[in-house]
Interface confidence: low
């Protein structure tokens, strides 16, 4: 099922470019904030911490100078920049920060930020928008199970990180729906959700609700999918 | 120098059962912590629990240590194991100066944990293939065991993909494979399960329209997104 | 459907209490933040206060800092404008809003930085009158 | 605190008619700006958000602009349902401040 806030933050970036990430902790009496990079299959690693009183980064050893700077846009609120992108440094940023909730030091992390560096030679389309293909219900799956299944495929968007959910119309209920892994397709991805819903909802119109970083306007898609008229239906006496 | 190895990169374990995560690691301090993380999918990075190497194993809720601190041991327990607990769980050590607050912490690579259903009665799935254009579904429902084959029938393959497998609301499994085929509309499914085959054919019906459910007259099947 | 409902206003006098209610629906204020503006009779909009239910963030503008207090209730869905000390140039309609979430910056960066108003209650006149 | 001097405060126009109106920021807000119409007794409506970006729904005639720190609300040709007070507003900093407002009435 889906959950519309559990999506990680992303940001995508050209080699050579900058990035920002913004440190998302609540606290505001911290002295130390730190940096963290989990790249798939390795281990999360710190990069450096920055000392809130004296505004000054600390980076561990064998990072360059200069590629990594936190700033403070206002009081308690830090932002970690960093210069002269590589495609290596894609991966999930953390800040992080220790905390004494109860009465016991942990060390507490943000919700991480997900940060894509391609090379400008990737030859991605101007439109990297999730593409809908919407499936209605098969006339045998609505006539033998009493249920219809809808599935909303999107291709060829990029980058992968989308939140898909399903919505009647007319009602801001988020459904219970499945859903793949996002998978790569050349250089984009493609990604399909399915919901299943009882027979006395195909007659209610469906939305399969997609939000992407790169949807035009900045706005979520919705796929309509149309109401199901199923009585025009007759079984062949062999599938009783 | 200081290190952490978590050898199992994944793990697999029924529902309700308990499923232990190794880690081991090396330093040269005397005094220090080793922390649990749990990493969702959204790559949210959760504290689970602490365990001093100076204290007795730590215990909270369903989370227990058994800590060996001469063999560098530290084992996660998460006991009545729930689906909710798939996940990627990180161990960490931590630097002793915690004073200071400028301390890192050393992570292992972690290790994946995949909560499985409940064991349940062997059930054959239904069969249902999806059209629109050139793009073919299979969907398959409502299955147990997990073990499963999906293939789609046709000549004039274009493209497939791997299939979805996920747990159903009913503690089963539901699957969906897709594909684009040039003669879309002669591809059929054939699913080989608990070493039987299942033929989307065994489910059609016979029907005054075409493949699909009709849309109602007045709807536009060809629907546009809105954006 | 998103609606912002507000209540909670009425005649009081200077010194006096009031507690302002901003019932949301279509969303979850937990998930969301949740602002108030003022507006007095014959003038333009003044920024009150915001909430960050989830990060328990909230920020006043100086003329109330220190007076009133903005919660919410993300049981009952519902953000609320404690007033105190109250004075006469607190008369105002007083509006509920909700920013807008669009990509990339409030919903990716969490932040306040980016975040116009586009839903609105329909106001409540409070009136601080001896 | 961010000052967000509008103006005019007020101008005569006809239905037709190109209107402008200004908004000058008293430091950097990046395109943290964003236009409001407000009609009497009604809350105020989003038209233009991040300085250039047209709000779902609202006509095309409306556009937003920036250049450094001035911020601009165009409406192409004046339609009757436009009379009404517009206001500005900077939020890419608390405070969040608005402008003085432009009321537009009809010539």
């Known amino acids: 099922s889906s959950n519309l806030e559990g999506r990680t933050k992303s940001v995508t970036r050209q080699t050579g470019s900058s990035a920002e990430i913004t440190c998302d902790l609540t606290v505001t009496n911290t002295f130390y904030i730190h940096w963290y990079l989990h790249q798939e299959g390795k281990a999360p690693q710190r990069l450096l911490y920055y000392d809130v009183s004296t505004a000054r980064d600390v980076l561990e050893s064998g990072l360059s100078p200069g590629k990594y700077y936190t700033h403070t846009p206002r009081r308690w609120s830090w932002i970690l920049r960093l210069q002269n992108l590589i495609e290596n440094d894609s991966g999930v940023y953390y800040c992080a920060t220790w905390d004494r909730p109860l009465n016991a030091w942990i060390k507490t992390f943000a919700k991480g930020t997900r940060l894509i560096v391609t090379s400008p030679d990737k030859q991605l389309d101007a439109d990297v928008s999730p593409k809908p293909t919407i499936f209605l219900p098969s006339i045998a799956e609505t006539k033998l199970q009493k249920a219809g299944t809808y599935l909303c495929l999107l291709e060829k968007f990029f980058p992968d990180v989308i939140k898909i959910h399903w919505q009647e119309k007319k009602s801001n209920t988020i459904l219970g729906s499945q859903e793949g892994n996002t998978m790569k397709t050349n250089d984009t991805y493609m990604k399909f959700s399915w919901l299943t819903v009882p027979e006395k909802s195909l007659d209610k119109e469906h939305r399969c609700i997609v939000r992407h970083e790169n949807n035009k306007n900045g706005v979520d898609q919705e796929i309509i999918f149309p109401p199901i008229k199923t009585d025009v239906i007759t079984m062949d006496p062999k599938d009783n | 120098a200081q290190k952490v190895t978590q050898a199992q990169s994944s793990v697999s374990m029924p529902v309700r059962k308990a499923v232990t995560l190794n880690c081991l690691y090396e330093t040269s301090w005397w005094s220090y912590y080793i922390f649990w993380y749990k990493q969702l999918p959204s790559k949210e990075m959760i504290f689970l629990i602490r365990q001093g190497s100076d204290e007795q194993n730590a215990k909270s809720g369903r989370y227990s240590v058994n800590f060996k601190k001469a063999a560098k041991s530290v084992a996660l327990t998460i006991s009545a194991l729930q689906l909710e607990d798939s996940a990627k769980y990180f161990c960490a050590l931590g630097e002793p100066n915690h004073f200071l607050n400028t301390d890192k912490l050393i992570f292992g690579k972690g290790t994946r944990v995949t909560v499985e259903p409940r064991s349940q009665p062997h059930t054959k799935p239904s069969v249902f293939v999806m059209k629109n254009g050139t793009n073919v579904a299979c969907l398959v429902k409502e299955f147990y065991p997990k073990d499963i084959r999906i293939n789609l029938v046709s000549s004039k393959k274009i493209t497939e993909f791997d299939p979805a497998i996920v747990i159903s609301p009913s503690g089963k499994y539901n699957a969906v494979k897709l594909g684009k085929y040039e003669d879309s509309n002669s591809v059929t499914c054939s699913v080989q399960h608990d070493n039987k085959t299942v033929h989307s054919t065994d489910f059609e019906v016979k029907t005054d329209s075409t493949d699909h459910v009709k849309p109602k007259e007045t709807e536009n099947t060809k629907q546009p997104s809105k954006s | 459907e998103v609606q912002l409902v507000e209540s909670g206003g009425g005649l009081v006098q200077p010194g006096g209490s009031l507690r302002l209610s901003c019932a949301a629906s279509?969303?979850?204020?937990?998930?969301?933040?949740i602002h108030w503006v003022r507006q007095a009779p014959g003038k333009g909009l003044e920024w009150v206060a915001s909430i960050y239910s989830s990060s328990g963030y909230t920020y006043y503008a100086d003329s109330v800092k220190g007076r009133f207090t903005i919660s919410a209730d993300t049981s009952k869905n519902t953000a609320y404008l404690q007033m105190n000390s109250l004075r006469a140039e607190d008369t105002a309609v007083y509006y509920c809003?909700?920013?807008?979430?669009?990509?990339?910056?409030?919903?990716?960066?969490?932040?306040?930085?980016?975040?116009?108003?586009?839903?609105w209650g329909q106001g409540t006149l409070v009136t601080v009158s001896s | 605190d961010i000052q967000m001097t509008q103006s005019p405060s007020s101008l005569s126009a006809s239905v037709g008619d190109r209107v402008t109106i200004t908004c000058r920021a008293s430091?950097?807000?990046?395109?943290?700006v964003a236009w409001y119409q407000q009609k009497p007794g009604k809350a105020p409506k989003l038209l233009i958000y991040s300085a250039s970006s047209l709000y779902s729904g609202v006509p095309s005639r409306f556009s937003g602009s920036r250049s450094g720190t001035d911020f601009t609300l165009t409406i192409s040709s004046l339609q009757p349902e436009d009379f009404a007070t517009y206001y500005c507003q900077q939020y890419g900093e608390y405070p969040i401040t608005f402008g003085q407002g432009t009321k537009v009435e009809i010539k």
């Open positions: 430091q950097s807000v990046s395109s943290a």
């Open positions: 279509g969303f979850t204020v937990s998930s969301s933040s």
């Open positions: 809003a909700r920013p807008y979430y669009w990509y990339p910056y409030y919903y990716w960066s969490g932040g306040w930085e980016y975040a116009a108003f586009d839903y």
